[in-house]
C-alpha cells in the first residue's frame, strides 16, 4: 500500500445557460481554500433546487470544475474563480471530472 | 452540519444602532458563506446581506446599502450585522444563515432558497 486512495473518474462537457437566478450551484476550493486534502482544484459543493445546474442534471455535487469556457481552474484563488463564474456570461461551458 | 445562534436584537428608536451577532459551530466556518435575512410579520423571509468564507465578497439588499454591514470573524466562528440609521421598516425576526462553498450566482439573486443552516432568529424592533 503507498497510501493513496486512487479513484475512477470521467470528464464531461456541461453545456449550461444561465437561468433567472443564475447558474444555480455552488463551489470551494482554490489555492487559498484547499477544501479537499493536497487539491486547490474547484469542487461544487451543492446544487440549488430548481436552479439552472439541477434542471440540466449532469452537474453533481462533489464534482471537480477543470476549465469555465475553456479557462483552466488550476491555481486559482477562491475568490477569482468565483468572479469566473459568475463573469461567464449566458451560455456556459464546464470542463468537469465526475468520481465514480 | 453547523448549528447558528444570534444574538443582539433589542428595541432602538429611530435612526439607531444595533449589531448583530451570530456564533456558528464547525470546524470548517471558513468554507461557509454566511447571510442574513429578515422576515416581517406576514411577509416571506427576505435576505438582507451575505459575506463570502474569507470575508472578501460582500452583498447587500438595496433597502440596507449604506446603513448595514456584514463582517465575520473566523477565528472567533462569528459573523456580525451592524445596523445603522434604523428605520422602522426595519423591524423584523433577524436570522442569520449558512451555506457551504461560494454561489456563483451574485446576490442580486439571493433567496433563502441558497442557504441551508438557519438559526432561530433575533427580533429587531425600531420605533418612531
Known amino acids: 500500500m503507498n497510501g493513496r486512495v486512487d479513484y475512477l473518474v470521467t470528464e464531461e462537457e456541461i453545456n449550461l445557460t444561465r437561468g433567472p437566478s443564475g447558474l444555480g450551484f455552488n463551489i470551494v476550493g482554490g489555492t487559498d481554500q484547499q477544501y479537499v486534502s493536497n487539491d486547490s482544484g474547484i469542487y461544487v459543493s451543492r446544487i440549488k433546487e430548481n436552479g439552472a445546474a439541477a434542471l440540466d442534471g449532469r452537474l453533481q455535487e462533489g464534482d471537480k470544475i477543470l476549465s469555465v469556457n475553456g479557462q483552466d481552474l488550476k491555481n486559482l484563488l477562491h475568490q477569482d474563480a468565483v468572479d469566473l463564474f459568475r463573469n461567464a456570461g449566458y451560455a456556459v461551458s464546464l470542463r468537469v471530472q465526475h468520481r465514480l | 452540519d453547523v448549528q447558528l445562534v444570534e444574538s443582539g436584537g433589542g428595541l432602538v428608536q429611530a435612526g439607531g444602532s444595533l449589531r448583530l451577532s451570530c456564533a456558528a459551530s464547525?470546524?470548517?466556518?471558513?468554507?461557509?458563506?454566511m447571510g442574513w435575512f429578515h422576515q416581517a410579520p406576514g411577509k416571506e423571509r427576505e435576505f438582507v446581506a451575505e459575506i463570502s468564507g474569507t470575508g472578501g465578497n460582500t452583498g447587500y439588499a438595496d433597502s440596507v446599502k449604506g446603513r448595514f454591514t456584514i463582517s465575520r470573524d473566523n477565528a472567533k466562528n462569528t459573523v456580525y450585522l451592524q445596523m445603522n440609521s434604523l428605520k422602522p421598516e426595519d423591524t423584523a425576526v433577524y436570522y442569520c444563515?449558512?451555506?457551504?462553498?461560494?454561489?456563483?450566482?451574485?446576490?442580486?439573486?439571493?433567496?433563502?432558497?441558497?442557504?441551508?443552516?438557519w438559526g432561530q432568529g433575533t427580533q429587531v424592533t425600531v420605533s418612531e
Open positions: 464547525g470546524h470548517t466556518f471558513s468554507s461557509y458563506t
Open positions: 444563515a449558512a451555506v457551504i462553498g461560494s454561489p456563483t450566482d451574485s446576490s442580486d439573486y439571493r433567496s433563502s432558497l441558497d442557504y441551508d443552516y
